[in-house]
């Protein structure tokens, strides 16, 4: 057993049928020695009596939050929380398996840049009685700060007859080297509490691997003279990292028919502009990727050929 | 929101068997820890046994250990008890019961619950 937070305890259960269970000791937070009575949430059935209540935590059913009292008057609380391992596996039934870019992947994080900023997050299909805390740091045995916002509902999505809740965090690295090269991982951890439930889910990563810009800005085209030809022009976007010369951007440019049969024409740079054959009906795509480190590529920036 | 109805209740004899379905609707039902309780007259509702989401771990009251069974199909949204060497102290309104938390013997951990359906044991 150990603290989550003040009066917040969890309870670590090797759960199989007929498992003995932990033995957990409760202590009653009073100067009190006599005349002290134990109760389970809101049940008046007593459970014990004395300073001390020793139970065996077999289930759920016995989670929840103790009280001790004396002559009607409440004297301090336990919340007692399960975190249940089954087969050597903690359980991860909070969170659902995205399984991109592989399975088991509860956590998902991005960053637009290196400046140390990254957002990660997570799906759920639980509602109600739900909380989420994050703490994250660079290393684990010597660890360097990271400060991690608030878990906030980002998106709420249908899937088949199930909803879907997208939570999120920003996180920042206090002592942020853009241009150095990273030797030690981000870690993050968050600890989920459905109801009487505690799990938690981890995440190991450098910076540079979760890279994702954001599209080009300001995407144009200008006509060339007598031709079918266009010269299509973009920025690098404003948030990614400066100087340019240094944190460098490569770019595809996509030409695209109405139909997603039609065969797509695609022209590498490292400038940003290209010029490319202008079909009618198509549309010009550009996206953009770190040039020197093969990360996520960013979102498609289009615009129509008319 | 789940829906949840409980079919196969009658009358039987003494060490006959008996088997209850409960036939969920709504909400995906895989999601969901079930159970199933029983309440005699004048008693309060008394926990049965349960079966996580997948199937695959049960959880019983000593009074129906190897006796009872639950399984569940979740491609058919049934969770099932199947009821064997019957006593006529098992006469009760049976109850299924959907949840999150497995394995839970408490009504408190269970958010959705069927009407019931009576199960009568004969000497």
């Known amino acids: 057993i150990w603290e989550l937070k003040k009066d917040v305890y969890v309870v670590e259960l090797d759960w199989y049928p007929d498992a003995p269970g932990e033995m957990v000791v409760l202590t009653c937070d009073t100067p009190e020695e006599d005349g002290i009575t134990w109760t389970l949430d809101q049940s008046s059935e007593v459970l014990g009596s004395g300073k001390t209540l020793t139970i065996q935590v077999k289930e759920f059913g016995d989670a929840g939050q103790y009280t001790c009292h004396k002559g009607g008057e409440v004297l301090s609380h336990s919340l007692l929380l399960l975190h249940k391992k089954e087969d050597g596996i903690w359980s991860t039934d909070i969170l659902k398996d995205q399984k991109e870019p592989k399975n088991k992947t509860f956590l998902r994080c991005e960053a637009k840049n290196y400046s140390g900023r990254f957002t990660c997050w997570w799906l759920t299909t639980i509602s109600t009685d739900l909380t989420f805390s994050v703490k994250s740091s660079r290393g684990s045995s010597d660890p360097q700060g990271v400060t991690c916002g608030a878990a906030t509902l980002s998106a709420e999505r249908v899937r088949g007859d199930n909803k879907e809740y997208e939570y999120s965090v920003e996180c920042q690295e206090d002592s942020a080297c853009p241009a150095a090269e990273e030797s030690l991982p981000i870690e993050v951890m968050v600890d989920a509490v459905h109801k009487l439930k505690y799990e938690n889910y981890t995440s190991s990563f450098f910076i540079r691997d979760i890279i994702k810009p954001d599209p080009p800005k300001n995407l144009q085209l200008k006509p060339l003279k007598n031709s079918r030809q266009v010269e299509v022009s973009w920025e690098y976007p404003d948030t990614w990292s400066t100087p340019h010369s240094y944190f460098s951007l490569t770019f595809c440019v996509q030409v695209q028919g109405k139909s997603k049969r039609e065969k797509k024409d695609r022209v590498f740079t490292d400038k940003t502009s290209a010029t490319v054959i202008c079909r009618k009906n198509a549309s010009i795509s550009v996206r953009a990727q770190d040039r020197y480190y093969s990360s996520s590529w960013s979102e498609w920036a289009s615009v129509p050929c008319s | 929101e789940v829906q949840l109805v409980e079919s196969g209740g009658g009358v039987v004899q003494a060490g006959e068997s008996l088997r209850l379905s409960c036939a969920a609707s709504g909400r995906s039902f895989s999601n969901y820890e079930m159970g199933w309780f029983r309440q005699a007259p004048g008693t309060e509702r008394e926990f049965v046994g349960t079966?996580?989401?997948?199937?695959?771990?049960?959880y019983y009251a000593d009074s129906v250990k190897g006796r009872f069974t639950i399984s569940r199909d979740n491609a058919k949204n049934t969770v099932f008890l199947q009821m064997s060497s019957l006593k006529p102290e098992d006469t009760a309104v049976y109850y299924c019961?959907?949840?999150?938390?497995?394995?839970?013997?408490?009504?408190?951990?269970?958010?959705?619950w069927g009407q019931g359906t009576q199960v009568t044991v004969s000497s």
């Open positions: 019961a959907a949840g999150w938390l497995f394995p839970s013997s408490l009504s408190r951990d269970y958010d959705f």
């Open positions: 079966i996580n989401r997948r199937g695959s771990s049960t």
